[in-house]
């Protein structure tokens, strides 16, 4: 029959080539001369010419060694034609199966594999998977079937069989207990992949197993006892650095220390933080300590880690005895800022107030006083008693030194400690108004026409406070009332000056007396420029010249 069973050809054949494979034969060759040909990839299409057929004999030839890993199967068609070219058979399928030779070694996908596993894990824990490939056939033969094994382990501590590898999957697992990062942080395994399911060619690679840190070591204080000296009143003062050792991985949560004041800080005076680099506990004062109240504190500090312990571990405790050192504390004015009401213009030598300070120190220290800042120089202070007296005229209306009726003075108290310390207080004198200023008109110079003159409105000001101001009263003196009139408006805060008789062009003094609600009188001379003009004028016109 015009049929060919699949032809098996081993790869890497040594020849000689051409090499006979099979003879195509049609039983029609009894009747007529038959010519044979083949088509398909490997014959008349790429890769061309690998196979050929002798036209007259039908012998199928192989022209070169085959490579299964390149092409594992060739599908050709055999053709049979008569001398005249007519097809005498249907095209016949010719399958050429390239059988595998173990011509490839296994290859690991990496030279070095890296994996990690937590210290202290139980046997059976998976670490990593390694992979080797083999280009040979692993379906019909064992040529490409890879078996994995561990050739060696370094270091061999605690013993040389800490890991196992699954011979088929390449999964590396822990086989023994005793992984301790603090003793062996990394294992190097030489792994093997062997084809023929373990009986063939071998290749090696390295698997590096990093042992990850677990928090299986507690931080320990070293030393456990500390003595520190702290000056009283210091806030944020570093009291002591507490040192711990921890065998776990530096700068990991299992190593980083967390400190807690367990006892001895009833007043919440202390705080403890962890130094980010040294891991030390930095004990500092949160509030100032008071030597006079308590001169020694005994603190108990416990240390743990940021990460929880993976097993029950005893915690380490440190004892810190903090000695509070006495400091010569500054006297403190009571109150720190003192408000005193005093009438302006009081006589010199008149007492203003007594302003004293207290010393927190228990020794009976002598306090002396002096004025630190008195801008106007109006006051004096008794160094022993703290008595403040007036030595100048207190003037509420002095805009240079008084703001919103308040004159501010800074005083100083100094103790006789060694070295002496000082404290300051602020004395706020609220000056009570006295009617010591009369009313003043504005402006004090006017220009007015001598014909149909416009009334001149002058504003009245008084530096004093109510009730020592409006309503004001006006009166003309020194015969000024012959030519002028002065009237205060209804509100009582302006005076209207009018020219009631003709005056020739010239400059005149108008004597105006103004008095406030408290009858404080002030005489003001108004310079009036009278012009030859009608109605409103600002400056006198020049003399008229005819032309």
């Amino acid at each position: 029959d015009w049929v060919v069973a699949p032809i098996s050809v081993p790869e890497n054949g040594k020849g000689p080539f051409p090499q006979r494979l099979n003879q195509l034969k049609s039983n029609k060759d009894r009747d007529t001369k038959i010519f044979y040909s083949i088509t398909g990839p490997g014959a008349d299409s790429p890769p061309e010419g690998v196979f050929a057929v002798e036209k007259e004999t039908g012998w199928l030839l192989l022209n070169k060694p085959l490579d299964r890993e390149e092409i594992a199967k060739y599908e050709l068609f055999g053709h049979a034609v008569s001398e005249n070219g007519a097809s005498v058979e249907d095209p016949m399928n010719i399958s050429i199966i390239v059988t595998d030779q173990n011509d490839h070694k296994p290859k690991f996908t990496q030279d070095t594999f890296r994996g990690s596993v937590l210290e202290g894990v139980l046997p059976g824990t998976s670490v990593m998977q390694v992979t080797a490939t083999d280009e040979d056939d692993a379906i019909y033969t064992y040529n490409g079937v890879v078996a994995y094994s561990i050739h060696s382990q370094e270091p061999k501590d605690p013993h040389d069989l800490m890991f196992t590898i699954h011979r088929s999957t390449g999964t590396i697992s822990v086989i023994s207990s005793g992984l301790d990062r603090e003793k062996v942080p990394e294992y190097t395994l030489t792994i093997q992949a062997t084809d023929m399911d373990g009986d063939g060619s071998t290749t090696t690679a390295v698997a590096v197993v990093e042992i990850l840190d677990a928090n299986d070591n507690a931080p320990m204080f070293d030393p456990q006892k500390y003595e520190a000296h702290v000056p009283e009143n210091a806030v944020g003062h570093e009291v002591q650095r507490l040192t711990v050792t921890d065998l776990d991985a530096p700068n990991s949560p299992a190593w980083r220390a967390t400190y807690l004041i367990m006892g001895g800080d009833d007043g919440d005076h202390f705080t403890i933080t962890t130094h980010p680099e040294s891991n030390q506990g930095i004990l500092t004062t949160r509030k100032g300590l008071d030597f006079e109240a308590k001169n020694q504190h005994t603190l108990y500090v416990e240390v743990t880690n940021e990460a929880p312990f993976v097993l029950k571990l005893p915690t380490s405790t440190a004892t810190i005895v903090v000695h509070v050192e006495d400091v010569n504390e500054a006297p403190v004015f009571v109150p720190p800022s003192k408000v005193v009401e005093v009438q302006e213009g009081i006589p010199t030598g008149e007492p203003v107030c007594v302003y004293t300070a207290e010393d927190p120190d228990k020794e009976n220290q002598k306090i002396s006083y002096r004025i630190l800042r008195d801008p106007a120089g109006w006051l004096a202070m008794d160094p022993d008693s703290g008595q403040v007296t007036a030595v100048g005229t207190l003037d509420r209306e002095d805009e240079q030194f008084v703001r919103n009726n308040i004159y501010e003075v800074m005083v100083l108290a100094m103790d006789n400690g060694s070295p002496p310390t000082t404290g300051t207080g602020t004395l706020l004198l609220t000056l009570i108004d006295v009617n010591d200023h009369g009313p003043v008109p504005e402006p004090r110079q006017i220009t007015i026409c001598n014909q149909s003159p416009v009334r001149q409105v002058l504003n009245i000001t008084d530096k004093d406070l109510s009730p020592h101001t409006s309503p004001f009263q006006a009166q003309l003196t020194d015969d000024s009332d012959i030519y002028w009139t002065a009237e205060v408006n209804e509100e009582g805060d302006t005076v209207v000056l009018s020219l009631k008789k003709f005056l020739k062009q010239d400059t005149y003094d108008v004597h105006l007396s103004l008095s406030d609600h408290g009858n404080k009188e002030q005489l003001t001379v108004i310079r009036a420029t009278v012009c030859d003009c009608h109605g409103h004028v600002e400056t006198c016109p020049g003399p008229w010249k005819g032309g």
Partner: antibody
């Protein structure tokens, strides 16, 4: 009738080159592997080169590899042997021969003499 | 390379004699062996392929046998046309190698 006719032989100096030809007729030249075989005077036969039917693949023994090149022109039904760097020991009658039944040397030419001498 | 050792190198025989020529391969070549006949001044001619298959037109007095490493060519009744030199050739391994030849001459 199968006929193979060699030509191109002659006298050549050592180190010289020569190209032999083999004209084929009487069979489908393009579907048969072809070879060259030589026979030194009074000596036995020695295989020199083979080429696949399509001309894609060539094969040589170590004795001539790198010096001799076999080729074919299927459109002209002609086989060639280019011989370079000729040596005295290459002196022989050179036969072209065809594969037949998938195995060597079913048909032979009458041969052409190559003499390498100074 | 596979060495082919032919024996004898020369053989004297009479017409009608049964003649046997031996070819020994240095390695197993299966049945990949041909026998060639060469007459003086002529091209060789293939007689037998695949150890024992006769080429077309070759008289039936010629036969071949053997496999592996030991092969024989037998002429059952020597004829005048049979006086020639006979060569074996192995094509089981590359390179193709010939035997040294056996010259059959008239006794």
């Amino acid at each position: 009738e199968v006929q193979l006719l060699e030509s191109g032989g002659g006298l050549v100096k050592p180190g010289g080159s020569l190209r032999l030809s083999c004209a084929a007729s009487g069979f489908t030249f393009s579907s048969y592997a072809m070879s060259w075989v030589r026979q030194a005077p009074g000596k036995g036969l020695e295989w020199v080169a083979t080429i696949s039917s399509g001309g894609h693949y060539t094969y040589y023994p170590d004795s001539v590899k790198g010096r001799f090149t076999i080729s074919r022109d299927n459109s002209k039904n002609t086989l060639y042997l280019q011989m370079n760097s000729l040596r005295a020991e290459d002196t022989a009658v050179y036969y072209c021969a065809s594969y037949y039944y998938g195995i060597p040397f079913g048909y032979w030419g009458q041969g052409t003499l190559v003499t390498v001498s100074s | 390379d596979i060495q082919m050792t032919q024996s004898p190198s020369t053989l004297s025989a009479s017409l009608g004699d049964r003649v046997t020529i031996t070819c020994r391969a240095s390695q197993d070549i299966g049945i990949n062996l041909i026998w060639l006949q060469q007459k003086p001044g002529k091209a060789p001619k293939r007689l037998i392929y695949d150890t024992s298959s006769l080429d077309s037109g070759v008289p039936s007095r010629f036969s071949g046998s053997g496999s592996g490493t030991e092969f024989t060519l037998t002429i059952s009744s020597l004829q005048p046309d049979d006086f020639a030199t006979y060569y074996c050739l192995q094509y089981g391994s590359s390179p193709l190698t010939f035997g040294g030849g056996t010259k059959v001459e008239i006794k």
